[in-house]
Interface confidence: medium
């Protein structure tokens, strides 16, 4: 199971002092910045138990293995479900803590209930403040059952769940019908996926017999040990105030683990620390009791004394859980509870034993999970013990599981089971990723998904030119950092592969798939300069430039023109894709804008030095369109146009421009200037008879303005073909019939 503990500080006089801490004992836990260790997540889960919104809770990371949640401002903030998520990949695990309000109407006799598939679970809610209304039981927030208030038994409302199955797991609550949901009793039901003492996909495998209240995990058969116990079967007590799978963590504060609730991965759930009990874990165990929640009884024999943290402390000459075994009986010593080896390695395993008579080499054997017995190849005999060494044949995945070291003498026998984890060296599933490239170097991210097991201890990057038969170059890198491959050849393809290793002998995995990474072209070195520019309209600019003359071919694919509008903080880039080009027309610019302009040569994706900048001011845009344009045929060759001046003029109009075009005609339109800006009427002459024309016009101040609406009109009668339109204008007189 993942070494993940959620600690709740239950000293509840002041909610502001309340905190939750999630502690991970996993290698690489919580680093979060790399692919091997996703971050520890600690949060309130509002999906089932919703509380009134308050100020956001504060999350503080203390190193890579610990995260703490604080900032609770009122008691109602505490009520509900909290979860911590840790571990990587398939080992990602969620630990859940359920907090009840000490002032609730109903209180759970026991918050966490872990039961086996097919068992009957009984949830008991104790009446703390009576109400004479129905009691509603909910499962995961949905209605489940109703009890009448008269149905309380000895001041408790019971919910009996016969033949429970894994889908029955979840958060249960008991609430008086008209009370606030925050006054509910909240429970957590964990249903193991197998019957008692079994684990595995078909529940065919036998659990190791977890001691001291440990719970057998239904997926992997490991014991999830209560806080304060360690070992494959939780056989070993930690020193007082310590917890974690290897007793590596220390309870905070001077009073040790008092007042702390410990939540561990399912199927364990939550309990007080070893030596403590009560709803707030502040009561020491009664004499004769020990362990988490004081659930264990010592029953020490042969003069052993009961320690509330560790159980029986045996006098000299005795050992065993109840001091029931004489020291004359042989005893396996200091056997690691868990060993890890890499696939296809041939490790040596040592097993030490003592006793009277003294164990010899032949009296110690090693049994594999498949029942195969290994005999030791050599033994080291010391005054107080014999250590047998076993040479293990090449390991296969099926060797994962519980191994057993057994010692037999005429004084009796002892055995110790230990877990062997056969790990698969990691193999990259993908090629490394190119981050950036230059002409002589490549920056590569070696972080890739992989098959097999972590943690990753080293990453090797192998590379060589594509289609080359030369030896691979190798660089060893930190798993969390990007790598720069240097001193490469420009414009060259390189084959790049990743090899991952995990700790231990034989931890190197196979090489991952190759990928082709190509170095960039040489950087262009020539600096162009701007020859000149001229404005071709309020939004158009023609630019020309030159390059210095150098011998040899031009290193470049084209030019990049950049226009910087400092007022708006906008940059416009124009790509000229011919290296021979020395001029470009820039259109769609903003009239009346001050631009900074420069040009640079590019080659592939690389830019050369920019030219010295030039400053260009485009003329402002022209005035608004003339209004109410109207056309009226006067004869077979004349049409009169009338209009009104544009509104909101930025300055005096210098002229009007009329556009004349034959309707449906394919030719270019004709533009005619009206040079007397005070005019509001003009006659267009020299038109063809019986011909439909389109007219529109615009005004000019410093630049040409917007076009007016287009009007249509036909010339009259069948006259002679005219030479072409000309105009005559005059001011339209108000009220005069024209």
């Amino acid at each position: 199971a993942v070494d993940l503990t959620l600690l709740a500080n239950l000293r509840l006089t002041d909610p502001q002092r309340f905190f939750l801490t999630c502690v991970s004992g996993e290698a690489g836990a919580g680093r979060g910045s790399d692919a091997w260790g996703p971050p520890l997540l600690l949060e309130k889960d509002d999906r089932i138990v919703r509380t009134p919104p308050g100020p956001p809770l504060r999350l503080a990371r203390n190193g890579s293995h610990q995260v703490t949640l604080r900032g609770f401002s009122k008691p109602s903030d505490l009520v509900g479900v909290f979860s911590c998520v840790g571990g990587a990949g398939a080992r990602r695990t969620r630990v859940i803590y359920v907090h009840n309000s000490p002032g609730a109407h109903l209180l759970p006799d026991k918050v966490t209930h872990t039961v086996n598939k097919g068992d009957t679970a009984v949830l008991s809610a104790r009446v703390h403040k009576e109400k004479q209304t129905d009691v509603i039981w909910k499962s995961n927030g949905s209605y489940f059952y109703t009890l009448d208030w008269h149905e309380a038994q000895d001041g408790r409302f019971l919910l009996q769940l016969p033949n429970v199955q894994p889908p029955s797991s979840g958060i249960y609550s008991a609430t008086y019908l008209e009370a606030s949901p925050l006054g509910s009793a909240f429970f957590r039901l964990i249903v193991r996926g197998c019957g008692a003492g079994r684990w595995g996909p078909g529940c065919t495998k036998e659990c190791p017999g977890c001691l001291h209240g440990g719970v057998c995990h239904d997926h992997d058969g490991e014991c999830v040990c209560p806080p304060g116990f360690t070992g494959t079967r939780c056989e070993q007590a930690c020193r007082e105030g310590r917890f974690g799978q290897s007793c590596q963590e220390q309870c905070p504060g001077i009073s040790g683990c008092r007042g702390l609730t410990f939540c561990l991965p399912d199927p364990y759930g939550c309990s007080c620390g070893s030596g403590w009990r009560g709803s707030q874990c502040q009561e020491a165990c009664a004499p004769g009791h020990f362990g988490a929640d004081c659930r264990l009884q010592c029953q020490c024999q042969n003069g052993g004394t009961c320690d509330r943290f560790s159980g029986c402390v045996c006098p000299s000459g005795w050992h065993g859980v109840h001091c029931e075994k004489s020291d004359r009986i042989p005893q396996i010593l200091n056997m690691a509870s868990e060993l890890e080896f890499n696939l296809e390695t041939m490790p040596r395993i040592n097993c030490a034993a003592a006793g009277n008579p003294f164990p010899v080499r032949g009296s110690i054997e090693l049994r594999k999970p498949d029942g195969t017995v290994l005999l030791s190849t050599k033994a080291i005999v010391e005054p107080e013990k014999t250590t047998a060494e076993f040479e293990v044949p090449r390991l296969v995945l099926a060797d994962s599981g519980f191994w057993e070291c057994r010692v037999s003498t005429s004084g009796g026998q002892d055995s110790r089971r230990f877990k062997v984890n056969v790990k698969v060296p990691p193999v990259p599933l993908a090629a490394p990723r190119l981050l950036t490239k230059q002409s002589r170097q490549l920056v590569v991210s070696p972080l890739v998904s992989f098959s097999g097991d972590g943690p990753i201890s080293t990453v090797r990057l192998h590379y060589r030119p594509q289609d080359s038969t030369m030896d691979w170059s190798t660089i060893v890198v930190d798993p969390s950092e990007n790598v720069t491959l240097m001193n490469l050849r420009p414009k060259t393809g390189y084959s790049v592969r990743v090899q991952l290793s995990r700790p231990g002998e034989g931890g190197e995995g196979a090489w991952g798939p190759p990928t082709l990474m190509t170095t960039d072209c040489p950087e262009p070195l020539l600096q162009p300069w701007l020859e000149g520019w001229h404005v071709e309209g309020t939004d158009r600019l023609r630019v020309s430039w030159s390059l210095p003359l150098v011998p040899g071919p031009l290193v470049g694919d084209g030019f990049l023109l950049r226009l910087w509008d400092g007022t708006r903080g906008q940059e416009r880039r124009e790509n000229v894709s011919s290296p021979q080009a020395r001029t470009a027309l820039l259109t769609g610019l903003t009239p009346g804008t001050h631009y900074q302009l420069d040009v640079q040569l590019y080659h592939c994706t690389l830019l050369g030095p920019a030219s010295p900048p030039a400053h260009v001011l485009l003329p402002p845009s022209g005035p608004p369109a003339p209004r109410h344009l109207h056309a009226q045929a006067l004869s077979d060759s004349e049409i009169q146009l009338t209009w009104k001046h544009p509104e909101a003029l930025p300055g005096p109009i210098s002229k009007y421009v009329v556009e004349v075009q034959v309707a449906g005609g394919a030719g270019d339109p004709l533009w005619i200037d009206v040079d007397r800006p005070e005019e509001t009427s003009t006659i267009i002459r020299g038109l063809n008879a019986s011909t439909r024309y389109l007219f529109r016009m615009r005004a000019s101040i410093q630049g040409l303005g917007d076009w007016s609406n287009t009007v249509e009109e036909s010339t009259l009668g069948n006259g002679l073909q005219a030479e072409g339109p000309v105009q005559e204008s005059r001011a339209a007189e108000e009220g005069l019939d024209q």
């Epitope: 919703r50 509380t51 004479q132 209304t133 129905d134 509603i136 909910k138 927030g141 949905s142 209605y143 489940f144 059952y145 109703t146 009890l147 009448d148 008269h150 149905e151 609430t175 019908l177 008209e178 606030s180 949901p181």
Partner: antibody, heavy 125, light 109 residues
Framework: EVQLLESGGGLVQPGGSLRLSCAAS???????KMWWVRQAPGKGLEWVS?????????YYADSVKGRFTISRDNSKNTLYLQMNSLRAEDTAVYYC??????????????????WGQGTMVTVSS | DIQMTQSPGTLSLSPGERATLSCRAS???????LAWYQQKPGQAPRLLIY???SRATGIPDRFSGSGSGTDFTLTISRLEPEDLAVYYC??????????FGQGTRLEIK
């Protein structure tokens, strides 16, 4: 399909007895409070009795207390109403109904979400 | 015991009109336990609104409930011919007793 089906109604003389049944289907009967509600001809609705899921608690309207008995058989998904000492004023259509609790984050709501089609009980000499 | 009084006794409106039905409790009650039912001629009642304002499953959105304390309202925004029915309000008490209003008959002109 979630449904309730009443049976057992009929004509009975004053002072006589009758047993109504209500068969439930389409939901977990053993989890819900079940009720009998009646409606005299041309009149409004009147609650008669309620029984809790376990069968351990029952309540009656004052007008039927001591004469009617509500019960349930969770294994058969059936609700019963044993009516003794019947009177003319007990003449009505008798409905069985399920009350379902919905809960939000702040409170729970109770309402009759499923009704049977009703069975007519006529008490007349 | 709390009494529930509905008004008017009968309401006669045309299709498309808005119907407003009132229910008054003799003392302040929790809106969580107030429900409205529709009973069409010859049929069993049907739940429309629970918790004073939440629409039951499958009920058209032209039906809405509101109110708190002692005064509660059922509104039908656009009457349809099939809305012809008797409408009852109902209160779940904190004891198992429940109280129905006497009903409002809705007639469609």
């Amino acid at each position: 399909e979630v449904q309730l089906l009443e049976s057992g109604g009929g004509l009975v003389q004053p002072g006589g007895s009758l047993r109504l049944s209500c068969a439930a289907s389409g939901f977990t009967f053993s989890k819900y409070k079940m009720w009998w509600v009646r409606q005299a001809p041309g009149k409004g609705l009147e609650w008669v009795s309620v029984i809790y899921p376990s069968g351990g608690a029952t309540y009656y309207a004052d007008s039927v207390k001591g004469r009617f008995t509500i019960s349930r058989d969770n294994s058969k998904n059936t609700l019963y109403l044993q009516m003794n000492s019947l009177r003319a004023e007990d003449t009505a259509v008798y409905y069985c109904a399920r009350s379902s609790l919905g809960c939000s984050s702040t409170s729970c709501y109770d309402a009759f979400d499923i009704w049977g089609q009703g069975t007519m009980v006529t008490v007349s000499s | 015991d709390i009494q529930m009084t509905q008004s008017p006794g009968t309401l006669s409106l045309s299709p498309g009109e808005r119907a407003t039905l009132s229910c008054r409790a003799s003392q302040s009650v929790s809106s969580s336990y107030l429900a409205w039912y529709q009973q069409k001629p010859g049929q069993a009642p049907r739940l429309l609104i629970y918790g004073a304002s939440s629409r039951a499953t499958g009920i058209p959105d032209r039906f809405s409930g509101s109110g708190s304390g002692t005064d509660f309202t059922l509104t039908i925004s656009r009457l349809e011919p099939e809305d012809l029915a008797v409408y009852y309000c109902q209160l779940f008490g904190s004891s198992p007793r429940i109280t129905f209003g006497q009903g409002t008959r809705l007639e469609i002109k």
